[in-house]
């Protein structure tokens, strides 16, 4: 079998074994077989063996074309069949790829999530490559000048430690493949200006039994950053807008934010801040059902979010997968 | 028509071994080519290994050779892929693939089965 090919001839791809997908493209096989005048010269692929397009150039070397070549990979031998030999022989094997040069990365982001010591860049790749593409992320500092490169093959983790040449920096990606290489826009941080505060997270739910019932929502966050502006939005499960109310917050302590909902609804909530005056968003927190009740009053703790429903103190249901509209965690 | 059930997946950590088995019923004379591809998510799914019936009879992708291992019990209808050495990189659903010469390519497909390679 061929698990290590040792080749009995040579086998080579037209324009090269890594090419652009949808090429034609031509597999080139030539036998250097002892006491062997090869009678006919066989190629597989994957290993079925190809019936069509070949050519057979002189006496030892043998042509293999194909239009429009659109695998992404294939594994490729081929064999001879030689006078005196019942088996066919074998001559030598190369996998070959097909894709695309890389695209130019953009929308560059670095954020630095608080407490997590590190600075997390990342990038819009552009279109599937197909073949193995890496990512070098430059960092300069724009005080020092000096440069630190990062290879990845998707995002990278900064440690904030190795920042050490100020607080301004310049950030570009640049994307290499077989194919091509693309350099993106340079990106300019200011290390106080991208952090994001530790995750909003609402704790609680309870509605109040009032003249106009009211919702009280409990929310806290770790963040020890001062200025923090927070969204929380909200709606029935049956619907698909949002409505979102906006907080100046101070995490000193348990917030509290109140609503006059609908009775006997069930409403899910999401909340993510910023630091204020600041570009980047928390993702949107966990969803957070409640049901209004009819008449009585209600409470709904985070720690009993699952789908029963009593009468009394009821409990509400938490599920990430079931809503439609949009739940994805948006930094920009 | 031809069915392939696949098993022996599972979760290995890296540097074990695991071996597939992909059994065929039906019209398993019309397949004179096993071969065993797998997708990881987000990829392409990949050539790992192929059994022929005649000419050379094994043949590897360059990614696997000298790691991997397929064979075939003809009485009993089934394909192995022994798989040793794994590497997180090895994690994809392994699914095998029936063809023939007279079709030029792999005419059946199994379900798969998951192989995970983590520690």
């Known amino acids: 079998g061929i698990t290590n090919i040792n080749c009995s001839g040579h086998i080579w791809v037209e324009p090269a074994t890594i090419f652009k997908m949808g090429m034609n493209i031509s597999i080139y096989c030539q036998a250097a077989i002892k006491n062997c005048q090869p009678r006919k010269l066989h190629f597989y692929k994957n290993g079925i063996k190809e019936r069509f397009q070949i050519t057979r150039i002189n006496k030892t070397t043998a042509r293999l074309w194909y239009k429009n070549f659109l695998e992404p990979h294939a594994s490729m031998y081929c064999t001879a069949e030689c006078p005196k030999h019942f088996q066919e022989t074998l001559i030598c094997g190369k996998d070959i790829s097909s894709g695309y040069p890389p695209d130019i990365p953009d929308e560059v982001t670095c954020v630095i999530y608080e407490y997590s010591g590190n600075m997390t860049c990342t990038w819009n790749a552009g279109k599937l490559t197909y073949i193995d593409t890496k990512y070098v992320v430059h960092v300069k500092s724009l005080e020092t000048e000096e440069e630190q490169q990062y290879l990845t093959s998707s995002y990278i983790n900064i440690s904030t430690d190795s920042l050490q040449g100020g607080k301004k920096y310049l950030v570009w990606v640049q994307a290499a493949n077989a194919l091509g290489m693309e350099e993106s826009k340079q990106l300019q941080i200011h290390l106080d200006d991208i952090v994001i505060p530790s995750a909003a997270v609402i704790s609680r739910a309870e509605t109040i039994n009032a003249t106009v019932p009211k919702t009280i929502i409990y929310w806290d966050s770790q963040t020890t950053i001062e200025k923090v502006s927070c969204e929380m939005r909200y709606k029935a499960t049956t619907n698909q807008t949002w409505n979102v109310k906006e907080f100046d917050t101070n995490f000193t302590y348990v917030q509290q934010s109140e609503f006059y909902l609908e009775p006997n609804i069930k409403y899910v909530f999401q909340v993510r801040c910023q630091e204020t005056g600041k570009r980047y968003w928390q993702p949107w927190s966990s969803l957070f059902f409640h049901k209004t009740p009819e008449t009585v009053p209600q409470v709904t703790s985070k720690a009993f979010q699952h789908d029963t429903w009593n009468s009394g103190l009821t409990v509400a249901s938490i599920s990430t997968g079931h809503l439609t509209s949009d739940n994805r965690g948006d930094i920009g | 028509e031809v069915q392939l059930v696949e098993s022996g997946g599972g979760l290995v950590q890296p540097g074990g071994s695991l071996t597939l088995s992909c059994v065929a019923s039906?019209?398993?004379?019309?397949?004179?080519?096993m071969g065993w591809f797998r997708q990881a998510p987000g990829k392409e799914r990949e050539f790992v290994a192929a059994?022929?019936?005649?000419?050379?009879?094994?043949v590897y992708a360059a990614s696997v050779k000298g790691r991997f291992t397929i064979s075939r019990d003809n009485a009993k209808n089934t394909v192995y892929l022994g798989m040793k050495s794994l590497k997180p990189e090895d994690t994809a659903v392994y699914v095998c693939?029936?063809?023939?010469?007279?079709?030029?390519?792999?005419?059946?497909w199994g379900q798969g089965t998951q192989v995970t390679v983590s520690s």
């Open positions: 693939a029936a063809g023939s010469d007279a079709s030029g390519g792999y005419d059946y």
């Open positions: 039906g019209r398993t004379f019309s397949t004179d080519v």
């Open positions: 059994h022929r019936t005649s000419g050379i009879s094994t």
